[in-house]
Interface confidence: low
C-alpha cells in the first residue's frame, strides 16, 4: 500500500514582512525522498520547480527559493507542493509575503527575472489547466 504523503510546510527567511530591495528565501519542507519541490504563487498557474533538494534533518528534506531583491510586486500568497514518486503531495498552507514600501522605490513588476520565485518560462495556457489535479502536466521538462 502506498504511503500517505504528509503535507509540506512553507516558511520565509528572514520573515514574511520584507523591506523593498531586501532578499527573502522561501523554504519548503517535506519528508525525505522528495524529488521535486514546487513553489506556487497565488494560483496553481504560476509556479517554480526545483530538484535542488537537501536533507534538513534525518526525517526531513527541504528546498529553498530565493528572491534576491524583493519588489512591491512580489507581495502575495505562496505555498509549496512536492513530488515524491509516484505521487504529488497536497499543498501546504498559504504564506503571505508582505513588502514594506520605501520612499522613492519603483512601482515594479511582479517578480524578478532570474529569481527563484517565478519560472523562466510559463507552461502554455492551452496545455495547463489550473484546476486540474496537481499530478497532471506538471513535469519539470514542461517548463524549460
Amino acid at each position: 500500500q502506498e504511503e500517505d504523503l504528509p503535507r509540506p510546510s512553507i516558511s520565509a527567511e528572514p520573515g514574511t514582512v520584507i523591506p523593498l530591495g531586501s532578499h527573502v528565501t522561501f523554504v519548503c519542507r517535506g519528508p525525505v525522498g522528495v524529488q521535486t519541490f514546487r513553489l506556487e504563487r497565488d494560483s496553481r498557474s504560476t509556479y517554480n520547480d526545483t530538484e535542488d533538494v537537501s536533507q534538513a534533518s534525518p526525517s526531513e528534506s527541504e528546498a529553498r527559493f530565493r528572491i534576491d531583491s524583493v519588489r512591491e510586486g512580489n507581495a502575495g500568497l505562496y505555498r509549496c507542493i512536492y513530488y515524491k514518486p509516484p505521487k504529488w503531495s497536497e499543498q501546504s498552507d498559504y504564506l503571505e509575503l508582505l513588502v514594506k514600501e520605501s520612499s522613492g522605490g519603483p512601482d515594479s513588476p511582479d517578480t524578478e527575472p532570474g529569481s527563484s520565485a517565478g519560472p523562466t518560462q510559463r507552461p502554455s495556457d492551452n496545455s495547463h489547466n489550473e484546476h486540474a489535479p496537481a499530478s497532471q502536466g506538471l513535469k519539470a521538462e514542461h517548463l524549460y
Epitope: 502575495g76 513588476p109 511582479d110 517578480t111 527575472p113 517565478g118 523562466t120 518560462q121 489550473e130
Partner: antibody, heavy 121, light 107 residues
Framework: EVQLVESGGGLVQPKGSLKLSCAAS????????IHWVRQAPGKGLEWVAR??????????YYADSVKDRFTISRDDSQSMVFLQMNNLKTEDTAMYYC????????????WGQGTSVTVSS | DIQMTQSPASLSASVGETVTITCRAS??????LTWYQQKQGKSPQVLVY???TLEDGVPSRFSGSESGTQYSLKINSLQPEDFGSYYC?????????FGSGTKLEIK
C-alpha cells in the same frame, strides 16, 4: 485558448467621453494584470494604463499623457476590463489594444485585435 | 521616467542578411526588456523577454543581448516573414514605455 476582445471604440468629438471594454477568456483572469496599449495611425506603440489583480488591491498605473483623463477598471466576476476615457483630445485617436501581462517574465503576451477610437470634430 | 531610444527607425535588408536593432534605456532597467514583432494590420507578438530569453516558438535566428543600458535584437539570416515592425518595451517601472519602433523592409 486565451482571447481578449475589445469593444466600444468609435468616433467622438474633442472633450467627449468613451468607454472601452475588453472581454477576456481562456485563462484565470483574476490572477493577471491587464494593460491598455494604443497605436496612432502609422505610429508606434504607446503604453496607456495597467490594472493589477486583487492580490495587489487592483493597483492602477497610467501614462502621463492620459493621467486624470482615463480610468482603468476591472470586473473579475465578468472577466472584463474597462477604459473610461474622458476629455478626449485629437491626439488620443488610435487603435486601442487590451493586453495580458505575463508576470512570469514581464511581457505583454496576449493581445486583442484592438478597437479603433477617432477623436474629431 | 525611463525613456527607450530605439534605432534605427527604419531598415532595408535582403533575405539572408543579418540585422541588429538597438534600444537604449535612459536608466538601469535590470534586463526587464521585451522585444515585440508587429506585422502590418496585426497585433504585436513577443519575441524575446528578460532581454535575452526567446519566447516559445520563436525561431533561433532571433536573439537578444544587453550591454549596460543598451539592448539589442539580432536577426540572423533574414527570412521573408521577418519583415515588419519591431518594438522594445521596458518593464522596470511605470510608465512601461516602448521604443519608437523599427520598420524592417525588404530591399
Amino acid at each position: 485558448e486565451v482571447q481578449l476582445v475589445e469593444s466600444g471604440g468609435g468616433l467622438v468629438q474633442p472633450k467627449g467621453s468613451l468607454k472601452l471594454s475588453c472581454a477576456a477568456s481562456g485563462f484565470t483572469f483574476n490572477t493577471y494584470a491587464i494593460h491598455w496599449v494604443r497605436q496612432a495611425p502609422g505610429k508606434g506603440l504607446e503604453w496607456v494604463a495597467r490594472i493589477r489583480s486583487k492580490s495587489t488591491n487592483y493597483a492602477t498605473y497610467y501614462a502621463d499623457s492620459v493621467k486624470d483623463r482615463f480610468t482603468i477598471s476591472r470586473d473579475d466576476s465578468q472577466s472584463m476590463v474597462f477604459l473610461q476615457m474622458n476629455n478626449l483630445k485629437t491626439e488620443d485617436t488610435a487603435m486601442y489594444y487590451c493586453v495580458r501581462e505575463n508576470w512570469y517574465y514581464y511581457a505583454l503576451d496576449y493581445w486583442g485585435q484592438g478597437t479603433s477610437v477617432t477623436v474629431s470634430s | 521616467d525611463i525613456q527607450m531610444t530605439q534605432s534605427p527607425a527604419s531598415l532595408s535588408a535582403s533575405v539572408g542578411e543579418t540585422v541588429t536593432i538597438t534600444c537604449r534605456a535612459s536608466g538601469n532597467i535590470h534586463n526587464y526588456l521585451t522585444w515585440y514583432q508587429q506585422k502590418q494590420g496585426k497585433s504585436p507578438q513577443v519575441l524575446v523577454y528578460n532581454a535575452k530569453t526567446l519566447e516559445d516558438g520563436v525561431p533561433s535566428r532571433f536573439s537578444g543581448s544587453e550591454s549596460g543600458t543598451q539592448y539589442s535584437l539580432k536577426i540572423n539570416s533574414l527570412q521573408p516573414e521577418d519583415f515588419g515592425s519591431y518594438y522594445c518595451q521596458h518593464f522596470w517601472s511605470t510608465p512601461f514605455t516602448f521604443g519608437s519602433g523599427t520598420k524592417l523592409e525588404i530591399k
